[in-house]
């Protein structure tokens, strides 16, 4: 959470941004809020990126002005125009690229004053893991798959019964480059599993952490997955 102040004569406004992460190839949002101003035509929003000449996006006089927009952002950005008057300057970003990572500045000018705040935007790839019982294996095994990760994550297994146990000797993890030659498919197999136990497959890089749980009993298989972004908020 970054809060910036600006001074315009005696007037300053608070601008707040949130560090966030973008998933390569998906659409993302760079969050920024400011003190509302009902005079829409008096609001100017400028998004800038460190190291880039030109603007990421500009919104003024109630509409976009993309005349100064840098080529790398062409056709990829939009503000939530109907939410600007209530203080939302967040930016929608289409088809997030690795090169979109960096420091952004959300600059605001209203009839009340001006202000700005920086935002650190991380980019990578992250996806939910899915665990299945691998019936093809010679012994009872679990197969944990996640289709898209970057940078290369670490993979670890845990179990409810054998808490603290190290499963690296009885698991095998591979990383397969996807067709776009950036992200990778993660596959990890855990061997010699026992029934009536809950196993967890944990995948983590510096952007996200995902966990897949599976409980295998004689009568059923229960699965659960969750994903959380790291260092955001």
């Amino acid at each position: 959470l970054i809060i910036g102040f600006g001074i315009s004569g005696k007037h300053f406004i608070t601008v707040t941004t949130f560090t966030s992460a973008g998933n390569i190839g998906e659409d993302g949002t760079l969050s920024c809020t400011f003190e509302p101003d009902i005079k829409l035509n008096g609001i100017v929003i400028q998004w800038l990126k460190e190291g880039i000449k030109g603007l990421v996006h500009e919104f003024k006089e109630g509409k976009d002005d993309l005349s100064q927009q840098h080529e790398m952002f062409r056709g990829r950005t939009a503000v939530f125009a109907d939410q600007v008057v209530v203080g939302n300057a967040s930016l929608r970003l289409k088809n997030v690229q690795l090169t979109d990572a960096g420091t952004y500045t959300c600059y605001i000018r209203t009839s009340k004053g001006k202000g700005n705040a920086n935002l650190e935007y991380k980019t990578g790839a992250f996806s939910m893991p899915e665990i299945n019982v691998d019936y093809n294996a010679s012994s009872e095994s679990l197969r944990c798959e996640a289709p898209r990760w970057f940078p290369q994550p670490t993979v670890a297994w845990a179990s409810q019964v054998d808490q603290g146990a190290n499963f690296s000797e009885v698991s095998n993890t591979s990383f397969e480059l996807n067709s776009e030659n950036v992200t990778m498919k993660v596959v990890s197999v855990l061997y010699n599993v026992t029934i009536n136990n809950t196993y967890s497959c944990m995948i983590e890089n510096d952007i996200a952490k995902a966990t897949g749980d599976i409980k295998v009993t004689d009568s059923e298989v229960k699965r659960r997955s969750q994903l959380q972004l790291l260092n955001s908020g």
């Epitope: 659409d27 993309l66 005349s67 056709g75 990829r76 088809n95």
Partner: antibody, heavy 120, light 107 residues
Amino acid sequence: QLQLQESGPGLVKPSETLSLTCTVSGGSIKSGSYYWGWIRQPPGKGLEWIGNIYYSGSTYYNPSLKSRVTISVDTSKNQFSLKLSSVTAADTAVYYCAREGSYPNQFDPWGQGILVTVSS
Amino acid sequence: EIVMTQSPATLSVSPGERATLSCRASQSVSSNLAWYQQKPGQAPRLLIYGASTRATGIPARFSGSGSGTEFTLTISSLQSEDFAVYYCQQYHSFPFTFGGGTKVEIK
């Protein structure tokens, strides 16, 4: 409401340059949230995006046509234009102009289209 | 470039029936997809954008769904004016590309 109208010659000789103009009425071409695009459709076939322009003059072209295409804008006349050089029979198509959202990038509305035939 | 594939090429449906049109992208386009309707001798008309948002003035019988690589346009109850060719278009990355179209004809 906003309307677009294509104009230009319906017949162009091979190796020459195809030139079309799109006139925008019912709204300003300087509307900030839009690009202005060209799309073509060969007879009985599908649609191909040619490229777009912003009112400030910045352009983006389909790489398959980039070496032959020029799109320009005249804000004083509320018009934008397409030039396609070194045409062949394969460039025979109905050419449409359309307003293109800056994002989302859908095309709406479209001009009625103009059939351009490349033949000697 | 991203290749858009539509199926079937032709769909024969009786008036009042439901029509389901498919569009597949060669790679994920997230929800950055639009659908258009084109009648003979006319320009295409925008129906859906953002994969599922109806354009202004489009009847509720038209609905879009899907994300990633698989998309569907559904016409819940075909009216006589709905018989036309339908195109999907991705705007996820340049160059923007269209599918080959699905012709919806009277059965």
